[in-house]
């Protein structure tokens, strides 16, 4: 069992205070009102790091 703030959620998941649990961000497209969706990135990470500003 994970307590809030003691360990980060794994990649692709976000903490739900409502459920006291890390939840999968993939469900947010279908169920956008979930509280953990606020912690999910709106866009996927860039596939590479830009080499110029």
């Amino acid at each position: 069992e994970q307590a809030p703030g003691t360990a980060p959620c794994s990649h692709g998941s976000s903490w739900s205070a409502d459920l006291d649990k890390c939840m999968d961000c993939a469900s947010c497209r279908a169920r956008p009102h979930s509280d953990f969706c606020l912690g999910c990135s709106a866009a996927p990470p860039a596939p590479f790091r830009l080499l110029w500003p």
Epitope: P4, D18, L19, K21, D24, R31, S34, L38
Partner: antibody
């Protein structure tokens, strides 16, 4: 049609272990986000949340009773179980199980409850 | 634990009038964009029935005369106009953190 039904021993003696079963239909406890809670209510009094089990077998307990509680499930049989050890007269109550799962928008309400099972602890 | 204090403990409201039930939390049950407060109705011999989830969202099938509001530590359940079938005990409950707790209940009588 979602429904839940609790069953238990009815009467037991102090120091014994209380075993409760919640049998449900109309949803699956293997569905992501789904869970079942146990809540109790002494006659004429308020509600107390006891424990919760998630679809992935993660468990949560009320800290005030955690040392005495064990929640478990049998997903294939659509059942959730609660054991309370070393019962006392203060554990006399109606015990409810309730579903907590995602609605259409992604809220997670305790939306369906069983009718409850009455438990009396008496010597 | 977050303690939820409901007031009044009981009230009598005339048919067609407004019933207002308060629930005060010992600490905030809201974030900047989410309020984790819910309301249930319980009639004698029956399990609680979910009325309102997340402060103001009416559960499916619940009449529009029920409404909820509030944020932070102060929440309200309003029933207007009150009908005979609304005679019951009402409970607030939060899901902001563990343990999930309930208020002590408010018994509504219809005059």
């Amino acid at each position: 049609q979602v429904s839940l039904k609790e069953s238990g021993p009815g009467i037991l003696q102090p120091s014994q272990t209380l075993s409760l079963t919640c049998s449900f239909s109309g949803f699956s406890l293997s569905t992501s986000g789904m869970g079942v809670s146990w809540i109790r209510q002494p006659s004429g009094k308020g509600l107390e949340w006891l424990a919760h089990i998630y679809w992935d077998d993660d468990k949560r307990y009320n800290p005030s009773l955690k040392s005495r509680l064990t929640i478990s499930k049998d997903t294939s049989r659509n059942q959730v179980f609660l054991k309370i050890t070393s019962v006392d007269t203060a554990d006399t109550a109606t015990y409810y199980c309730a579903r907590r799962g995602p609605d259409y928008y992604g809220y997670y309400p305790m939306d369906y409850w069983g009718q409850g099972t009455s438990v009396t602890v008496s010597s | 634990d977050i303690v939820l204090t409901q007031s009044p403990a009981s009230l009598a409201v005339s048919l067609g009038q407004r019933a207002t039930i308060s629930c005060r939390a010992s600490k905030s049950v809201s974030t900047s964009s989410y309020s984790y407060m819910h309301w249930y109705q319980q009639k004698p011999g029956q399990p609680p029935k979910l009325l309102i989830k997340y402060t103001s969202n009416l559960e499916s099938g619940v009449p529009a005369r029920f409404s909820g509001s509030g944020s932070g530590t102060d929440f309200i359940l309003n029933i207007h106009p009150v009908e005979e079938e609304d005679a019951a005990t009402y409970y607030c409950q939060h899901s902001r953190e563990l343990p999930w707790t309930f208020g002590g209940g408010t018994k509504l009588e219809i005059k």
